[in-house]
Amino acid sequence: KAMHVAQPAVVLANSRGTASFVCEYASPGKATEVRVTVLRQADSQVTEVCAATYMMGNELTFLDDSICTGTSSGNQVNLTIQGLRAMDTGLYICKVELMYPPPYYMGIGNGTQIYVIDPEPCPDSDF
């Protein structure tokens, strides 16, 4: 009955502050409408980073001002979070909800620890 959600344990953001990871869910049924939410857990506090609802076979659409982008393929969602800084290092949890058709299922991943290292400022150069 429970829906399993898998995501990588650790991801390192690149020098531009972008981190990508795959969120994969084992669907107990044939869902046509899915909602994916990225949550950040820090000091036992959970906050929403971004969310998107999509129809199976269609693209994920995040809000225009979202720091997330993503694509879906079957039961896999490829998520990218942009604009990260060192202070954003933390555990990012993928939550998947099968909204339609019934029954509703919710699945929560164990979280991906994203490490963000702010780039060193470039030294002044005479060239």
Partner: antibody, heavy 118, light 108 residues
Framework: EVQLVESGGGLVQPGGSLRLSCAAS????????MHWVRQAPGKGLEWVSF????????YYADSVKGRFTISRDNSKNTLYLQMNSLRAEDTAVYYC???????????WGQGTLVTVSS | AIQLTQSPSSLSASVGDRVTITCRAS???????LAWYLQKPGQSPQLLIY???SRATGIPARFSGSGSGTEFTLTISSLQSEDFAVYYC?????????FGQGTKVEIK
């Protein structure tokens, strides 16, 4: 501070109708799914209905299916439960509850009492 | 629907006692999707434990949850006077959302 305040309960005759409201404040209402849960006098908790973020997806307990309708108005931060064809066994305190990020019902209203009796 | 059965249905205990309540599910429930609530007379239910183990904000450390699969446990390590109430387990992983029938903790 998160607050959920129910209203609309009261005494109604069998076969009658009632509309419950739940006014939400202190959080971004449209970012959360919501539920109605009821508790008959001296009994346990019974889940009644669920509504998705945008109101497009709704689920009901078998005991109320076809008689109750859940809805929401995100512009007014309000959740509703339209109850038709009421029966004596629908007598209960009705609570609205917010779904927390990780699934459980993290905030509950104070409840509103619905009494179905002739 | 997943049925949840709590045991015992009621118990009498004294302040300082260790209390254990069990919740058995009719089918597999992932530990991420099992919650516990407490309800004091005349009040709304209050979230105690979510994800089988995690304490909700502001819940004292004397409350702890454990278990997996189909059997889950709520433990109060040292019962306080304010803990006399009714306790419910709930599964929130799939519809229909279901609650246990409740366990009433009374003063001995």
């Amino acid at each position: 501070e998160v607050q959920l305040v129910e209203s609309g309960g009261g005494l109604v005759q069998p076969g009658g109708s009632l509309r419950l409201s739940c006014a939400a404040s202190g959080f971004t209402f449209s970012h959360y799914t919501m539920h109605w849960v009821r508790q008959a006098p001296g009994k346990g908790l019974e889940w009644v209905s669920f509504i998705s973020y945008d109101g497009n997806n709704k689920y009901y307990a078998d005991s109320v299916k076809g008689r109750f309708t859940i809805s929401r108005d995100n512009s007014k931060n309000t959740l509703y439960l339209q109850m038709n064809s009421l029966r004596a066994e629908d007598t209960a305190v009705y609570y609205c509850a917010r779904t927390g990020w990780l699934g459980p019902f993290d905030y509950w209203g104070q409840g509103t009492l619905v009494t179905v009796s002739s | 629907a997943i049925q949840l059965t709590q045991s015992p249905s009621s118990l009498s205990a004294s302040v300082g006692d260790r209390v254990t309540i069990t919740c058995r599910a009719s089918q597999y429930v992932g530990s991420s999707y099992l919650a516990w609530y407490l309800q004091k007379p005349g009040q709304s239910p209050q979230l105690l434990i979510y994800g089988a183990f995690s304490r909700a904000t502001g819940i004292p450390a004397r409350f702890s949850g454990s278990g997996s699969g189909t059997e889950f446990t709520l433990t109060i390590s040292s019962l306080q006077s304010e803990d006399f109430a009714v306790y419910y387990c709930q599964q929130d992983g799939s519809s229909p959302w279901t609650f246990g029938q409740g366990t009433k903790v009374e003063i001995k």
